[in-house]
Structures are given as C-alpha cells and as structure tokens.
Interface confidence: low
C-alpha cells in the first residue's frame, strides 16, 4: 500500500464492567476492539469500511492499559494500510466488545456484546506526529492516538509519489522527502543516469561512462581530451584539429619532414660565405673573394 493509518490504543476504563445495554459482564468485560476506517461522512452510517477494518484479540478485562506491541497477535499500534492517495479526511469507528469466547479470535465467538463505541470524523494530514484524543461516555473512557504515515518508498502530502532509491544501470539517486529524485554524487540528468565527467573534460572531444572519468574521442588526447593528435607521420609540425600536420617554421611537405631552412639548421657554407635556401634540402653558398668549392671550403 501507499500509506498506513495507525491507531494506538492506550487505555480503556470500564470501572463498573457494564455493557451498552445496561447489563453487567460476568465475571468481567473481556474486552476486544473492532476498528472501521472509511471515507469522510458527515453522518457516519453502516456499510463497508472503505479504508479498511481490523479487530484485536482480548486486550484486558474492564479497565486496562494497552501496551505497545510490535508484532504478532495484539499488535499495537493497529495498522490499517491503504493503497490510494490519502484524501486528508476520514471517518473512524472504534467499538469495544465483550466476548465470552476465545481470547485470540474473539471476533468468531457467538454471544459477543457491545460495550461502547466512538466515532471520529475529520481531517488528518500525513505526518509522523501522533494526534492524541480521549472519548468519554457515561460508562467508559478510551484514550488513543492516531496518525497517517506513508509506506516505504512513498512520499508527499498524500503518499502518492513512489520513489525507490537506486544505484544501478538505470539510475543513481536517493529520494527527497517530497518524493523527488536527488542524484548521488557524480550523477546528473532527469533520472540521474548521466555521469558527471572529470571537471574540465572537453564537452565535444571527451565523454565518460562513470563519474570523474574523461575518455577521449578519436583524434584527441590528454587528461581533459583538449589536445589534438597530429597526423601519424608528422615530424616537425602541430595540429589544431585532429590528424592535421601544420608545419613548424622552416619545415615543409605533407609530414613536415622537408627542411626549408637548411642554411640555419646545418650551416653548410664555410669561410664567411653567404648561404641561401633554395627549396627542400637545397642551398647555395656564395663565396668571399679568394675562396671556392661547393661550400667555399677551398
């Protein structure tokens, strides 16, 4: 169900051990309760308990305190689960009965007699705070408290929002009190299924399949995938886009491996002669008077 109406019975007082018809119980009123929860009615009528009903075992004789009990027979608070949007209003009928029969299943015994009943009608918001109340009639007094809480994984003012925290293939989040998703660290997106990549990871050139990762797309490298990878055979060049080979100054050719500045790189001309570049690996030495040879070495 999406929520639970909880009713905590606290104390029942029937000092004279009387039934609603004025007769007395012999030897005492062995008391159990029938609870009927239904939609709000201006005038409470007989008919189905539309929000649920529950009966207790015998809880005591005449006057008694009802202890909290978490499980098994005689559980207190009583649990009335529902599987719909909590409307915020309700009608509650609590009947005290005497049984001459079985303690654990008094509901099935013949000869049960009504001791008293109370009807509560009104509004009740979902919340953890117990609303405490006490009802008296001429013969009996009942102290009790009640509340409506959402079941596990249900949230919101009417327990209508279902949210299951998860950390798996399809989402990584916890649930906020209103049922909205709160992504676990490192995840984003409507369903928290998109990892947040390493800070600074290039938006176009990098991606990630888990948080704080930066995987480079083809043609890019570096921790943040912001460095392009030049052409495979690029010798003396760089790139601004992948597989490019933009030659450094003085170099040419497809792979930037052809020396366009042989004079500077190799100083082939001797004895103060002048060196002139003339294409890849090409150069000419102009000799000073008195020198000769290809490199003015003679």
């Amino acid at each position: 169900g999406s929520g639970i109406f909880q009713l905590r019975l606290q104390e029942f007082v029937n000092q004279r051990g009387m039934l609603a018809n004025g007769q007395s119980c012999e030897p005492g009123c062995r008391t159990f309760f029938r609870i009927c929860l239904k939609h709000f009615q201006a005038t409470f009528s007989e008919g189905p308990c539309t929000f649920g009903n529950v009966s207790t075992p015998v809880l005591g004789t005449n006057s008694f305190v009802v202890r909290d009990k978490n499980s098994g027979s005689g559980r207190n608070p009583l649990q009335l689960p529902f599987n719909f949007t909590w409307p915020g209003t309700f009608s509650l009928n609590i009947q005290a009965w005497h049984t001459p029969g079985d303690d654990l299943r008094p509901e099935t015994s013949p000869g049960n007699s009504l001791i008293s009943q109370i009807i509560i009608q009104g509004s009740l918001a979902v919340g953890k705070i117990w609303r405490t109340d006490e009802q008296n009639d001429t013969l009996t007094r009942l102290s009790y408290s009640y509340r409506v809480i959402c079941s596990d994984n249900y949230y919101g003012e009417s327990c209508s929002r279902l949210c299951k925290k998860r950390d798996d293939h399809f989402g990584h989040y916890e649930c906020q009190p209103d049922g909205s998703l709160s992504c676990l660290p490192g995840w984003t997106g409507k369903y928290c299924d998109q990892p947040i990549c390493l800070s600074g990871c290039h938006e176009q050139n990098g991606y990630c399949s888990k948080p704080d990762e930066c995987i480079c797309r083809p043609g890019w490298q570096g921790r943040l995938c912001n460095e392009c990878i030049p052409h495979n055979g690029c010798r003396h060049g760089t790139c601004s886009i992948p597989w490019q080979c933009a030659c450094d100054e003085g170099w040419g050719g497809l792979f930037c491996d052809q020396d366009l500045n042989y004079c500077t790189h190799h100083s082939p001309c001797k004895n103060g002669s002048t060196c002139s570049n003339s294409g890849p690996k090409g150069y000419t030495c102009t000799c000073l008077p008195g020198y000769t040879g290809e490199h003015c070495e003679l």
């Epitope: 919101g156 279902l162 049922g179 998703l181």
Partner: nanobody
C-alpha cells in the same frame, strides 16, 4: 499493461552472430529503460545489456565489445546484436522493459513496473 514479443533466437556455431528483437506494445514512453537479461540452465537470471532513458547503454563485462544494444523509439523495439558468440552465451534471453510512470504531482517521481518477455532460446555450439 505492456506486452513484449522477442524474436531472433536460435542455434548458431561459436564465433557466429545473432540479432535479437523485442517489440513492446502498450503504455510505453520514451522515459522507459529497456534491456536484455539471460538465464542459463541452473543459474540465476543475469543482466546482459540495457539502454536507459537518455539512450545511454550499459553492458555486462562478459559481453562488452561483442554485443550491441540499440532501440527504435518509433517502433518501441529494442535490439541486441550478438557477435563472436561463445558456448557460454547459451541461455534463454529475456527482454525487459522498466516502465517509469510519473505519479500525480511528482516532479521526477516514478513508479517502477518491470515487464518481462517470454524469452527466446539462444544455443551456441562449439
């Protein structure tokens, strides 16, 4: 209600390929995760591959690089391309659709309903 119909299973030799299809009908939206699981004899059902809300794909380590999941939103169909099949891939393959239904007043509130197909047998012989 959602109905799933798988197809494409069969007998194939090790190293071969198969393509599984799963057509979904009913209340399917784009905010729906779809995936494939498998169950070998005597073993528990295990996750194989999934494709999430934003078309993000996920794979079990044992099938990474060999299997590819994809989906056609217009046809409400999810596919599993299985290459380089191994004998240990032999199993009944189940299509799964996890419908995320927005609940009243929910900003990102979702209810999870997982629907399973009937399964299709894949047998890889050595």
């Amino acid at each position: 209600q959602v109905q799933l119909q798988e197809s494409g299973g069969g007998l194939v030799q090790a190293g071969g390929s198969l393509r599984l299809s799963c057509a979904a009908s009913g209340n399917i939206s784009t905010g729906t995760a779809m995936g494939w699981y498998r169950q070998a004899p005597g073993k528990e059902r295990e996750f194989v591959a999934g494709i999430a809300y934003g078309a993000t794909t996920y794979y079990a380590d044992s099938v990474k690089g060999r299997f590819t999941i994809s989906r056609d939103n217009a046809k409400n169909t999810v596919y599993l391309q299985m290459n380089s099949l191994k004998p240990e891939d032999t199993a009944v393959y189940y299509c799964a659709v996890e419908v995320s239904q927005s609940t009243p007043g929910g900003r990102y509130s979702v209810a999870y309903l997982i629907y399973w197909g009937q399964g299709t047998q894949v047998t890889v012989s050595s």
